[in-house]
Amino acid sequence: MRRGPRSLRGRDAPAPTPCVPAECFDLLVRHCVACGALRTPRPKPAGASSPAPRTALQPQE
């Protein structure tokens, strides 16, 4: 059985390492992965009362 990588991360962990293009930062295991491996929140319907949230997972330029 493998431990999730997050289990080893201290509370004072550094900010996310910039990911290469076409990779995104996986907030749940705290490392860069292919963007296609991740699910993001469902988009808000047009005219929704609250603005769409910014995501911390966008590919690094």
Epitope: G4, R11, L27, A37, L38, T40, P41, R42, T55
Partner: antibody, heavy 117, light 111 residues
Framework: EVQLQESGPSLVKPSQTLSLTCSVT????????WNWIRKFPGNKLEFMGY???????YYNPSLKSRISITRDTSKNQYYLQLNSVTTEDTATYYC???????????WGQGTTLTVSA | DIVLTQSPVSLAVSLGQRATISCRAS??????????MHWYQQKPGQPPKLLIY???DLESGIPARFSGSGSGTDFTLTINPVETDDVAIYYC?????????FGGGTKLEIK
């Protein structure tokens, strides 16, 4: 839209092994995280563990010696195996998948398990 | 494990009034400037339904009567105004640290 459906026995005897299946439609289990959660009769919710896009598993330490989560990507299904069950494992078992922040936006309807001799 | 303590355990509110549910974490659930705190509603015979994620973001399709606030260790779910359909158990959940944990739940009833 992602849909999840649990299947498995409703009654298991103490000391036996519980095996549940979560069938996923609307998305591939090679994307995201695929969780098992259970709700006990007293309304307590417990996160059991997950298998993610790469096949990496994480298990709640409270279950670690008894639990296994596996998957079959060709069937788009993932599985829960819980060994040596006791009456304390009587609960409703849910499969669910979270988005970016770990918030679970899609859930199965749940399957109720009773552990009894 | 991060322990989430919800209060009150049960709550009776008049129709049209405000309901406020608190969730206190045993340690901060913030990381990278994000609060990894989420809120769910569960009705009998149904799975939990995601209402709020990242402490204050309203899930798609959830009415704006529901709102969330807080950071660090103290979080609040507010329902204003309360409607009959809101009778349910409400749970907070953190995904900041393994293992992910849930609060004990708050049962909302109509007065």
């Amino acid at each position: 839209e992602v849909q999840l459906q649990e299947s498995g026995p409703s009654l298991v005897k103490p000391s036996q092994t519980l095996s549940l299946t979560c069938s996923v439609t609307g998305d591939s289990i090679t994307r995201g995280y695929w969780n098992w959660i259970r709700k006990f009769p007293g309304n307590k919710l417990e996160f059991m563990g997950y298998i993610n896009y790469s096949g990496t598993t994480y298990y709640n330490p409270s279950l670690k010696s008894r639990i296994s989560i596996t998957r079959d990507t060709s069937k788009n299904q993932y599985y829960l195996q819980l060994n040596s069950v006791t009456t304390e494992d009587t609960a409703t078992y849910y499969c669910a998948t979270p988005h970016t922040y770990g918030a679970m936006d899609y859930w199965g309807q749940g399957t109720t398990l009773t552990v009894s001799a | 494990d991060i322990v989430l303590t919800q209060s009150p355990v049960s709550l009776a509110v008049s129709l049209g009034q405000r309901a406020t549910i608190s969730c206190r974490a045993s340690e901060s659930v913030d990381d990278y400037g994000i609060s990894f705190m989420h809120w769910y509603q569960q009705k009998p015979g149904q799975p939990p339904k995601l209402l709020i994620y990242r402490a204050s973001d309203l899930e798609s399709g959830i009415p704006a009567r529901f709102s969330g606030s807080g950071s660090g260790t103290d979080f609040t779910l507010t329902i204003n105004p309360v409607e009959t359909d809101d009778v349910a158990i409400y749970y907070c959940q953190q995904t900041s640290k393994d293992p992910w944990t849930f609060g004990g739940g708050t049962k909302l009833e109509i007065k």
